[in-house]
């Protein structure tokens, strides 16, 4: 058993049929010695008396808020949560496996630049009695600070019969060094509590591996005289690291017909303009990627040819 | 060419070669994210690798103030990786495919390090750790780790030379 926060404790349970329960001794936080009684949750029934209460925690029915009282007055609370371990593996019932980029990916994170700011998100089908708490650091043995905000519900989607909820959190490395080569990964730890179930999820990454620039901005077409060619121009996204002479992007320009089956013409360039042939009803799209490190491409920025 | 003591390197040549290094490093090991090498424990490999750190002056401001600190650090790293790519980690079993980009990568590392330090001039180089994996699978894993680490290193080096070429060239 360990303390998650003040008056909240996590009991780690081996979850198999013939596992013995965990013996837990609760102590009432009071100088009083006599006349102390214990109750659980909303029930007013006395579960035991004395400054300590010894319980066996085996089921979610044994978890909950234990309260000690004296003469009708509440003295202290202890909320017990359960963390299940099945076949030696901690349960992952609360979050959905996003399966990208690999199985057992519960947390996904992205950064728009090298500033040390990143966003992580996760999915769940649970809509109520759910809380998250996020901590992060650079490295784990001698951790350097990363500050994370509160996790918030960022999207709701209907997936078949189920509703899916997306939560996200923004974090910022306290002393980021955008130009340095990272040697220690960022660690992100999410504590998830659903009713009386506790779970924790972790992700470890280098900022360089989660970079995904915003799409190029100000995408414009300039027709070339007496030609079906156009000059496409764009700019670096505002959110990208500066100076651009140092933090350079490379771009992919694509001409795509109306039909998805039509052949796509693609051009790669380090410049912020390109000359392409604009077909009728086609659209021109541009996306960006770090020039020197193959992390994710940005989403496409698009304009119609006409 | 970078001459120890203060003169500037051939920024544009260094830029072109370092960008080529980036391309080669990624073609040698393109599996981004498919194998999480950090799960395999990096202690013996990457702890000894020379990283370009915050105080090495490789940021735009540091380069403007005095690019020599950064260039020396890059040179150290290039020599380190060049030795690693020439070691039995890459020459031993399992053999690399004949058209593997590792050979070109090795040559380009040497080429860029020579651009930075002509014959007869010596910067302090870092001792290469004695890594001699016994099993072919260990060697394979080590190659992946080294190439992943090299990708990060050459990306920073390429940024330095691109910025130098754009802002510090005579």
């Amino acid at each position: 058993i360990w303390e998650l926060k003040k008056d909240v404790y996590v009991v780690e349970l081996d979850w198999y049929p013939d596992a013995p329960g965990e013996m837990v001794v609760l102590t009432c936080d009071t100088p009083e010695e006599d006349g102390i009684t214990w109750t659980l949750d909303q029930s007013s029934e006395v579960l035991g008396s004395g400054k300590t209460l010894t319980i066996q925690v085996k089921e979610f029915g044994d978890a909950g808020q234990y309260t000690c009282h004296k003469g009708g007055e509440v003295l202290s609370h202890s909320l017990l949560l359960l963390h299940k371990k099945e076949d030696g593996i901690w349960s992952t019932d609360i979050l959905k496996d996003q399966k990208e980029p690999k199985n057992k990916t519960f947390l996904r994170c992205e950064a728009k630049n090298y500033s040390g700011r990143f966003t992580c998100w996760w999915l769940t089908t649970i809509s109520t009695d759910l809380t998250f708490s996020v901590k992060s650091s650079r490295g784990s043995s001698d951790p350097q600070g990363v500050t994370c905000g509160a996790a918030t519900l960022s999207a709701e989607r209907v997936r078949g019969d189920n509703k899916e909820y997306e939560y996200s959190v923004e974090c910022q490395e306290d002393s980021a060094c955008p130009a340095a080569e990272e040697s220690l990964p960022i660690e992100v730890m999410v504590d998830a509590v659903h009713k009386l179930k506790y779970e924790n999820y972790t992700s470890s990454f280098f900022i360089r591996d989660i970079i995904k620039p915003d799409p190029p901005k100000n995408l414009q077409l300039k027709p070339l005289k007496n030609s079906r060619q156009v000059e496409v121009s764009w700019e670096y996204p505002d959110t990208w690291s500066t100076p651009h002479s140092y933090f350079s992007l490379t771009f992919c320009v694509q001409v795509q017909g109306k039909s998805k089956r039509e052949k796509k013409d693609r051009v790669f360039t380090d410049k912020t303009s390109a000359t392409v042939i604009c077909r009728k009803n086609a659209s021109i799209s541009v996306r960006a990627q770090d020039r020197y490190y193959s992390s994710s491409w940005s989403e496409w920025a698009s304009v119609p040819c006409s | 060419r970078a001459v120890p003591g203060g003169s500037s390197p051939a920024w544009t040549q260094c830029q072109q070669l370092s960008q080529k290094l980036c391309t080669l490093a990624w073609s040698a090991h393109p599996l981004v994210g498919h194998m999480d090498l950090r799960e395999e424990g990096d202690e013996e490999t990457t702890n000894d690798v020379p990283h370009i750190q915050c105080g090495d002056g490789c940021d735009p401001q540091g380069l403007r103030d005095n690019s020599q600190f950064c260039l020396q650090r890059i040179h150290q790293g290039l020599i380190f990786y060049e030795k690693l790519l020439g070691s039995d980690i890459f020459t031993g079993e399992p053999s690399l495919l004949p058209d593997s980009p590792v050979g070109q990568l090795h040559a380009s590392l040497l080429g860029l390090s020579q651009l930075l330090q002509p014959e007869g001039h010596h910067w302090e180089t870092q001792q290469i750790p004695s890594l001699s994996p016994s099993q072919p699978w260990q060697r394979l894993l080590l190659r992946f780790k080294i190439l992943r680490s090299l990708q990060a290193f050459v990306a920073v080096a390429a940024r330095v030379f691109a910025h130098g070429a754009a802002t510090l060239s005579p």
Partner: antibody, heavy 119, light 107 residues
Framework: EVQLVQSGAEVKKPGESLKISCQSS????????IGWVRQMPGQGLEWIGI????????RYNPMFRGQVTMSVDKSSSTAYLQWSSLKASDTAMYYC????????????WGQGTMVTVSS | EIVLTQSPATLSASPGERATISCRAS??????LAWYQQKPGQAPRSLIY???NRQSGIPARFSGSGSGTDFTLTISSLEPEDFAVYYC?????????FGQGTRLEIK
């Protein structure tokens, strides 16, 4: 006052189905799991299983799994034990009981339902 | 599953005497053992839990002791209403199991 009131005695034929009930009152129904115990004529007590009234989480004795089904209706604070096809060997007194949280034993018992299966 | 063996199977005693019933487990159940009393035609009633804690409303003449595999229920001075069948139950490991019972009869 805590009370578990069980449905009346049943006489059934082999192969018939049956559902007996146990209505709880006088306490917070969702805080306490409900269990069932069998006592065959002239025999001792046998633990059938327990169930959570919150989410219907169930722990069956392997000996009874597939033979009986436990269920619960939160809205009426009632637990059920049912058979889809009774056998003569199901003849027994069935008790519902309240599981004490933080322990696991049964602190309050229903009066019992006698089930007789005979052709 | 854990087997609980009670002894004796039948105990004959007189009111005012001390009665001791033993319960032995086939493997350790820590202190997670309860005792119940059952009178003819009635449901069992909880007496002792966690090996030695008296259920509220149970007279002080009933006491429990033991841990691990050996447990004892003691009635210090028998009253006429104490003559009944007594069961021990372990609730450490599923499936929870009961002893076969001890009949306490008037000598």
């Amino acid at each position: 006052e805590v009370q578990l009131v069980q449905s009346g005695a049943e006489v059934k034929k082999p192969g018939e189905s049956l559902k007996i009930s146990c209505q709880s009152s006088g306490y917070s129904f969702t805080t306490y799991w409900i269990g069932w115990v069998r006592q065959m004529p002239g025999q001792g007590l046998e633990w059938i299983g327990i169930m959570s009234p919150v989410d219907s989480d169930i722990r069956y004795n392997p000996m009874f799994r597939g033979q009986v089904t436990m269920s619960v209706d939160k809205s009426s604070s009632t637990a059920y034990l049912q058979w889809s096809s009774l056998k003569a060997s199901d003849t027994a007194m069935y008790y519902c009981a309240r599981r004490r949280p933080g322990q696991g034993y049964f602190d309050f018992w229903g009066q019992g339902t006698m089930v007789t299966v005979s052709s | 599953e854990i087997v609980l063996t009670q002894s004796p199977a039948t105990l004959s005693a007189s009111p005012g005497e001390r009665a001791t019933i033993s319960c032995r487990a086939s493997q350790s159940v820590s202190s997670w053992l309860a005792w119940y009393q059952q009178k003819p035609g009635q449901a069992p009633r909880s007496l002792i839990y966690a090996a030695s804690n008296r259920q509220s409303g149970i007279p002080a003449r009933f006491s429990g002791s033991g841990s691990g595999t050996d447990f004892t229920l003691t009635i210090s001075s028998l009253e006429p209403e104490d003559f009944a069948v007594y069961y021990c139950q372990q609730y450490n490991i599923y499936p929870y199991t009961f002893g076969q019972g001890t009949r306490l009869e008037i000598k």
